[in-house]
């Protein structure tokens, strides 16, 4: 029959070539002379000439060694023709299977593999996976089946077998406990890949295992005891820098320190922060310390890390004895701002108040007083007693120096320390009103027509406070009442001036006396310009000229 079974040819055959593989034969050769040929890739198309056929005998020939890793199977067609070139058979499929030889070593996909694992993990923990490939066949043979193994480990601490590798997958895992980054931060494994499922050719690569840091070391104070000196009253003052050592990875959360004042800071006087570079604890004053109240503080500070400990660890504690140093403190006025009510216009030399300061220092220091700021120059202060007296006329209505009835004075106290220190106090004199101002009309100049004159309304003002103001009373004096009338309105805060007799055009003085509710009288001269006109006028018209 015109058929041929699949032909198996081992790769890398040593010849001699051409090598006879199989004979094509048509049973039509009994009737006529047959000529054989082959076509297909490997025969008449690339790669050409690998196979040939003896034209007359039908022997299939291999011309050169085969490489399975290049081409694993050839599919050719066999042809049979008669002498006249007529085809005597249908084209026949010829399959040539190249069988594998173990002619390739495994190859790792990288020369160096890198992986990492947390220190202190249990055995069984996966680290990384390595991969090797082998071009040989791994389906029908073991030629390309790779088995992985660890050849060596450096360093060999704490055991020479800290890791193992899955023989089939290449996954490296931890097999021994005792991974300690602080002792061995990195392991170098020489790994092997062997084909024939472990019985063939071997290749090696390197797997570097980085041991990652876990917070398995507590920060420790070094030293554990400190003595510091701090001047009293200093806020934000650096008291002491506390130093810790931590074996964990520098600048990691497992290394960075967190400080906590555990005891001794009853008044919440201190605070502690972590220096970002040195990791030191910087102890500073949050509030001023008072030597006179407590001259020594013993603080207990505990240190932990930003990251939680992965296991139970003893925490380190430092003791800091803070000695408070005495400083000459400024006298303090009591109260710092003193409000005193005093009548305006009191006689010169009259006492206003006593305003004194206390010295926080325990020594009996002498305090002297003086006025620091007295804008109007109205007061004097006894340097020894702190007695404030009037030396000028206190005027509530003085708008330059008095605001909202209050006259503000700054006083100074100085001790006799070395060097001397000063403190200031504020004296707020609330000036009580007296009826020292009479009512005043506004405006004091008017223009009025001498025919059908319009009544002139004048506002009345009084610098004093109620009850020394309205209702006001008006009276015309010096014969002004012959030509004029003055009447206060119902509210008592305006006066209406009217012309009651004809006056020729001119300027006249109207003598108006106003008195307030407290009968304080004020005489005011109103300048009245009388115009030749009717009704309302603002300025006198010019003389009339006929045409």
């Amino acid at each position: 029959d015109w058929v041929v079974a699949p032909i198996s040819v081992p790769e890398n055959g040593k010849g001699p070539f051409p090598q006879r593989l199989n004979q094509l034969k048509s049973n039509k050769d009994r009737d006529t002379k047959i000529f054989y040929s082959i076509t297909g890739p490997g025969a008449d198309s690339p790669p050409e000439g690998v196979f040939a056929v003896e034209k007359e005998t039908g022997w299939l020939l291999l011309n050169k060694p085969l490489d399975r890793e290049e081409i694993a199977k050839y599919e050719l067609f066999g042809h049979a023709v008669s002498e006249n070139g007529a085809s005597v058979e249908d084209p026949m499929n010829i399959s040539i299977i190249v069988t594998d030889q173990n002619d390739h070593k495994p190859k790792f996909t990288q020369d160096t593999f890198r992986g990492s694992v947390l220190e202190g993990v249990l055995p069984g923990t996966s680290v990384m996976q390595v991969t090797a490939t082998d071009e040989d066949d791994a389906i029908y043979t073991y030629n390309g089946v790779v088995a992985y193994s660890i050849h060596s480990q450096e360093p060999k601490d704490p055991h020479d077998l800290m890791f193992t590798i899955h023989r089939s997958t290449g996954t490296i895992s931890v097999i021994s406990s005792g991974l300690d980054r602080e002792k061995v931060p990195e392991y170098t494994l020489t790994i092997q890949a062997t084909d024939m499922d472990g019985d063939g050719s071997t290749t090696t690569a390197v797997a570097v295992v980085e041991i990652l840091d876990a917070n398995d070391n507590a920060p420790m104070f070094d030293p554990q005891k400190y003595e510091a000196h701090v001047p009293e009253n200093a806020v934000g003052h650096e008291v002491q820098r506390l130093t810790v050592t931590d074996l964990d990875a520098p600048n990691s959360p497992a290394w960075r320190a967190t400080y906590l004042i555990m005891g001794g800071d009853d008044g919440d006087h201190f605070t502690i922060t972590t220096h970002p570079e040195s990791n030191q604890g910087i102890l500073t004053t949050r509030k001023g310390l008072d030597f006179e109240a407590k001259n020594q503080h013993t603080l207990y500070v505990e240190v932990t890390n930003e990251a939680p400990f992965v296991l139970k660890l003893p925490t380190s504690t430092a003791t800091i004895v803070v000695h408070v140093e005495d400083v000459n403190e400024a006298p303090v006025f009591v109260p710092p701002s003193k409000v005193v009510e005093v009548q305006e216009g009191i006689p010169t030399g009259e006492p206003v108040c006593v305003y004194t300061a206390e010295d926080p220092d325990k020594e009996n220091q002498k305090i002297s007083y003086r006025i620091l700021r007295d804008p109007a120059g109205w007061l004097a202060m006894d340097p020894d007693s702190g007695q404030v007296t009037a030396v000028g006329t206190l005027d509530r209505e003085d708008e330059q120096f008095v605001r909202n009835n209050i006259y503000e004075v700054m006083v100074l106290a100085m001790d006799n320390g070395s060097p001397p220190t000063t403190g200031t106090g504020t004296l707020l004199l609330t000036l009580i009103d007296v009826n020292d101002h009479g009512p005043v009309p506004e405006p004091r100049q008017i223009t009025i027509c001498n025919q059908s004159p319009v009544r002139q309304v004048l506002n009345i003002t009084d610098k004093d406070l109620s009850p020394h103001t309205s209702p006001f009373q008006a009276q015309l004096t010096d014969d002004s009442d012959i030509y004029w009338t003055a009447e206060v309105n119902e509210e008592g805060d305006t006066v209406v001036l009217s012309l009651k007799k004809f006056l020729k055009q001119d300027t006249y003085d109207v003598h108006l006396s106003l008195s307030d509710h407290g009968n304080k009288e004020q005489l005011t001269v109103i300048r009245a310009t009388v115009c030749d006109c009717h009704g309302h006028v603002e300025t006198c018209p010019g003389p009339w000229k006929g045409g």
């Epitope: 923990t125 193992t164 300690d180």
Partner: antibody, heavy 117, light 111 residues
Framework: EVQLLESGGGLVQPGGSLRLSCAAS????????MSWVRQAPGKGLEWVSA????????YYADSVKGRFTISRDNSKNTLYLQMNSLRAEDTAVYYC??????????WGQGTMVTVSS | QSALTQPASVSGSPGQSITISCTGT?????????VSWYQQHPGKAPKLILS???KRPSGVSNRFSGSKSGNTASLSISGLQAEDEADYYC???????????FGGGTKLTVL
């Protein structure tokens, strides 16, 4: 030579607690993972819990998770097993075992825990 | 149900040889050469007799030997003696949180 000595076993009522200790000597304790393995009467070995050398990693069998706590004090070369909410099925000999560098176990002599009312 | 499968019992006469098998998977016995065997006499603690498939600790008789093929490890005892009567357990390393698997145990009876 590795030596492991368990203590703390005894009779306890269901729901009660016990704390087992295992004193180790003869090896660098902190470099070895430690385990508790138990054996119920007439039964095989059952792995209960394990702890890494530093104490940073632990493992528990599902049957004891949430009830048992393994811990170690490397400064005292001692392994502990705190057993709470004990049940009748926790009755067994409890062995302390060290996981050596050859991936095998060295065993203590065991301590008996009986949970019964 | 144990992770590694052992026969429940084997027996042999004094002087004979016996083999106990321990079958796992390609992720434990088949993947690593970390199979150990332990001997346990009644009322006693287990004792290591083989580690890393076939390594005997000092003091263990050379009548005990181990081997592995594929996913199955074997413990062989030659020249059986009465004191060999005990329970035998195999263990294997595996990757994962349960890093060691136990066999169910095999009771060896010396007839």
């Amino acid at each position: 030579e590795v030596q492991l000595l368990e203590s703390g076993g005894g009779l306890v009522q269901p729901g009660g607690s016990l704390r087992l200790s295992c004193a180790a000597s003869g090896f660098t304790f902190s470099s070895y993972a430690m385990s508790w393995v138990r054996q119920a009467p007439g039964k095989g070995l059952e792995w209960v819990s394990a702890i890494s050398g530093s104490g940073g990693s632990t493992y528990y069998a599902d049957s004891v998770k949430g009830r048992f706590t393994i811990s170690r004090d490397n400064s005292k070369n001692t392994l502990y097993l705190q057993m709470n909410s004990l049940r009748a099925e926790d009755t067994a000999v409890y062995y302390c075992a060290s996981w050596g560098p050859t991936a095998s176990l060295d065993w203590g002599q065991g301590t008996m825990v009986t949970v019964s009312s | 149900q144990s992770a590694l499968t052992q026969p429940a019992s084997v027996s042999g006469s004094p002087g004979q040889s016996i083999t106990i098998s321990c079958t796992g998977t390609s992720n434990d016995v088949g993947a690593y050469n970390y199979v150990s065997w332990y001997q346990q006499h009644p009322g006693k603690a287990p004792k290591l007799i083989l580690s890393e498939v076939n390594k005997r600790p000092s003091g263990v008789s050379n009548r005990f030997s181990g081997s592995k093929s594929g996913n199955t490890a074997s413990l062989s005892i030659s020249g059986l003696q009465a004191e060999d009567e005990a329970d035998y357990y195999c263990t294997s390393y595996t990757m994962g949180s349960t890093f060691m698997l136990f066999g169910g145990g095999t009771k060896l009876t010396v007839l």
